[in-house]
């Protein structure tokens, strides 16, 4: 085994670069000491360092740690938090081009329709933003109260247009018909399947991102242990103490120093795979009914054939309802 | 169906050009992000070795520090000694992850089934009780826009996908982006307190 | 560490096939990409396309779709590219390349395969 | 496609100075740009990524800087070893090489 060089007489070199570190020289020897206080960097004979050093040391190797990481996850980082406003941002556009190709089919199709089918559409794509971002709204209730809301106003200004403006009673009793006469078919549950399951998909996709940048942001900010930040001084600084400035690590006894400190880390590796093929595999089946973008872009068109499907039956509808608002009609005629 | 107003669609023939050439629709940026999040998936499991070789290791030199003294790079010294004597390595691994890193695999345990539970095949068929109305089925031929769910659910015709995100701003600034500390970046021979 | 060695020279007749091979060591092959780039004689470098080892999931770069076949084997931690009836243009040096593990740019780079095609 | 626009294709400098080559992204590439150093006979050598982040073992005379779809890569102190051809890598989709730049020292 080579014999160690003898240790810097003086302790210049260690102060020199020492003062890098923390300058103001006076935690320095002047010259090797017995170095009986430390606690680290063992030493076998005379060294330049001292408590104060060592405390120093262990701050600063812990600090490398935490700088490392950050370098480590900084692409990583950026392509996740990237992503992520990204769709949020896409998600948004979608839900605002739906509201208008939906405004824009009453305005053609429904002029009469369009004040009160505004504000209605406007809610429900309201809730859906809402939905996406993580709200706790029940799909079924947000397409429930879209065809509760326009019914009436489907009832008065299209199949009963005789029929005054506000009449609140007979909106009730329309709003209750409307279910029980299945009024617009099997469109109200067809929208639901289609909406619920496309926003579930999307919302979990976006949960997940989000989900992505608190992990790396949790391992970006970890605070290693004392042990560790030991471990570290030992392996990095403390060949320092005898003067051996020029000196590196050994490579095979780094990755034993490393596979301590990170042994929680790594535990996150099984999970951060699994997350992302997880992730993989949702993505895949986002299409068809499972794409939000699909499904909300073409609402407009099954709200348009929800309502030709009204108006197909309309005369059917008018009696039956008749009767059975008749309650409601008379109080208001009165 | 309903009526396309103008100002919100080009000719549908031209659009379909568009969109199986070059649109770049939400569906194609999903598949990217995966194709580079799987760039990523050793990230953790690397991680020691990343830190290894971007701190001081002796890579050509004769001789290393292996935590107590000065060895031969190749002898079997160099990566044990610096443990002996000392607080127990194992120990340390023993302790387990900290609570912070329990917490974030909870988490990823948790994302993971729902995301599980999302993809599973059972849950993509599309329910056959939307026919039971015996609603007009339309025509859904080759020419036509992608029919949602087949025939009998009021042959909803989506119209080709938005180009949408041509109004995304790409550049978003990672400084604007939430959970983003601003860190100087630390270049591994510029870290201020590792002696070159 | 990180090494990538490719099969050696080839020399082929024009409208005939060729197979180049990549064996991968020093990390897990099947949680990289591997890319293959394709550099003519005196001018620079063209990325063919990549593939993903774990799932056999690829990208080409359109240019190189039905000339480049991208395949691997998992067994012996090797990535293959294909390229069909070859003309004087494909003569080149292509390389493999693995995309990186904490950045997706290609980190680790074979020594490169003469490929001339001649009759 | 991504279309990557390098200059210099080539230039001459003196041992000790510096040098700067510059690569235009045809879009915004989000910082994903990579920078190569070619020798011949060799595979290239992956000098920088993420427009500024030095590869490990890589010495800091080699520095990267930008944003947007303007990037640039200089090499300070030049000394022998340098010659070679340099290249910058996108990518942000899929990837696109520039032309490279070759450089001599005078």
């Known amino acids: 085994q080579p014999p160690p060089p003898p240790p810097d007489a003086t302790c210049h070199q260690v102060r020199s670069f020492f003062q890098r570190l923390q300058p103001g020289l006076k935690w320095v020897p002047e010259t090797p000491v017995p170095g009986s206080d430390l606690q680290v960097c063992l030493p076998k004979g005379p060294t330049c360092c001292s408590r104060k050093m060592e405390e120093k040391y262990q701050l600063t190797a812990r600090l490398n740690m935490e700088q490392l990481l950050q370098s480590a996850s900084m692409e990583l980082k950026f392509l996740i938090i990237q992503n992520a406003a990204v769709f949020q941002e896409a998600f948004e556009i979608v839900v605002r081009h739906a509201k208008n190709y939906t405004n824009a089919m009453f305005k053609n199709n429904y002029p009469s329709l369009t004040p009160q089918a505004f504000e209605f559409v406007g809610e429900f794509f309201t809730d859906v933003s809402l939905y996406i971002l993580g709200s706790d709204i029940n799909v079924d209730d947000m397409v429930n109260e879209l065809f509760d809301s326009l019914f009436p106003v489907i009832y008065t200004q299209l199949m009963n247009p005789g029929l005054p403006d506000s009449a609140l009673d007979i909106n009730e009793c329309l709003r209750g018909a409307r279910r029980d006469l299945k009024v617009f078919g099997n469109f109200p549950k067809l929208i639901m399947t289609q909406v619920s399951k496309s926003l579930q998909v999307t919302r979990i996709f976006l949960q997940a991102l989000n989900l992505g940048i608190e992990v790396i942001n949790t391992t970006d900010h970890l605070k290693f242990s004392k042990d560790c930040g030991r471990m570290l001084t030992r392996m990095w600084y403390c060949s320092y103490c005898q003067g051996l400035m020029m000196v590196k690590p050994c490579g095979g006894y780094c990755n034993v120093v490393m596979q301590g400190c990170m042994a929680g880390v790594v535990e996150i590796d099984k999970y951060w795979r699994e997350y992302i093929l997880s992730l993989e595999e949702l993505v895949n089946g986002m299409y068809r009914i499972y794409d939000m973008e699909n499904v909300l872009l073409g609402l407009f068109s099954t709200i348009h054939d929800s309502i030709q499907y009204v108006q197909k039956n309309a005369g059917k509808l008018t009696t039956t309802i008749g009767k059975l608002c008749a309650h409601s009609q008379q109080r208001q005629y009165r | 169906s309903a009526y396309y107003p103008e100002d919100l669609f080009i000719d549908k023939k031209v659009l379909k050009v568009a969109h199986v050439e070059h649109e770049e629709t939400l569906s194609s940026r999903r598949r990217e992000l995966i194709q580079k999040l799987k760039s990523f998936i050793s990230f953790y499991s690397a991680l020691p070795g990343y830190i290894c070789s971007h701190s001081p290791v002796a890579e050509n030199d004769t001789l290393c520090w292996n935590g107590q003294e000065l060895v031969e790079r190749y002898s079997q010294k160099a990566a044990r000694n610096g443990m002996k004597n000392q607080f127990n390595l194992h120990e340390l691994k023993m302790k387990g992850p900290e609570p912070v890193v329990s917490q974030i695999i909870d988490k990823l345990k948790h994302i993971n089934q729902l995301l599980r539970t999302m993809s599973m095949p059972k849950g993509r068929v599309l329910d056959k009780n939307l026919d039971e109305e015996g609603f007009e089925s339309g025509d859904c031929g080759d020419d036509e826009d992608e029919c949602i769910g087949g025939s009998g659910d009021g042959m909803i015709k989506v119209k080709n996908q938005l180009r949408f995100l041509a109004e995304l701003a790409y550049d978003l600034d990672v400084d604007d982006a939430p959970g983003n500390s601003q860190q100087a970046t630390p270049k591994d021979n510029e870290i201020s307190t590792f002696h070159n | 560490q990180v090494q990538l060695q490719q099969s050696g020279p080839e020399l082929v007749k024009p409208g005939a096939s060729v197979k180049i091979s990549c064996k991968a060591s020093?990390?897990?092959?099947?949680?990289?990409?591997m890319n293959w780039v394709k550099q003519r004689p005196g001018k620079g470098l063209e990325w063919i396309g990549r593939?993903?080892?774990?799932?056999?999931?690829?990208n080409y770069n359109g240019r190189f779709k039905g000339k480049a076949t991208l395949t691997v084997d998992k067994s012996s931690s090797t990535a293959y590219m294909q390229l069909s009836s070859l003309t004087s243009e494909d003569s080149a040096v292509y390389f493999c390349?693995?995309?990186?593990?904490?950045?997706?740019?290609?980190?680790?780079w074979g020594q490169g395969t003469t490929l001339t095609v001649s009759s | 496609d991504i279309q990557m626009t390098q200059s210099p294709s080539s230039l001459s400098a003196s041992l000790g100075g510096k040098v700067t080559i510059t690569c235009k992204a045809s879009?915004?590439?989000?910082?994903?740009i990579a920078w190569y150093q070619h020798k011949p006979g060799k595979g290239p050598r992956l000098l920088i990524h993420?427009?500024?982040t030095l590869q490990p073992g890589i010495p800091s005379r080699f520095s990267g800087s930008g944003s947007g779809r303007d990037y640039s890569f200089s090499i300070s102190n030049l000394e022998p070893e340098d010659i070679a051809t340099y290249y910058c890598?996108?990518?942000?989709?899929?990837?696109?090489f520039g032309g490279g730049t070759k450089l001599e020292i005078k």
């Open positions: 390349a693995r995309g990186g593990v904490f950045t997706m740019a290609l980190d680790h």
């Open positions: 020093g990390y897990a092959f099947s949680s990289s990409w």
């Open positions: 593939i993903y080892p774990g799932d056999g999931d690829t």
């Open positions: 879009q915004d590439i989000n910082k994903y």
């Open positions: 993420y427009t500024s």
């Open positions: 890598l996108q990518y942000d989709n899929l990837f696109t």
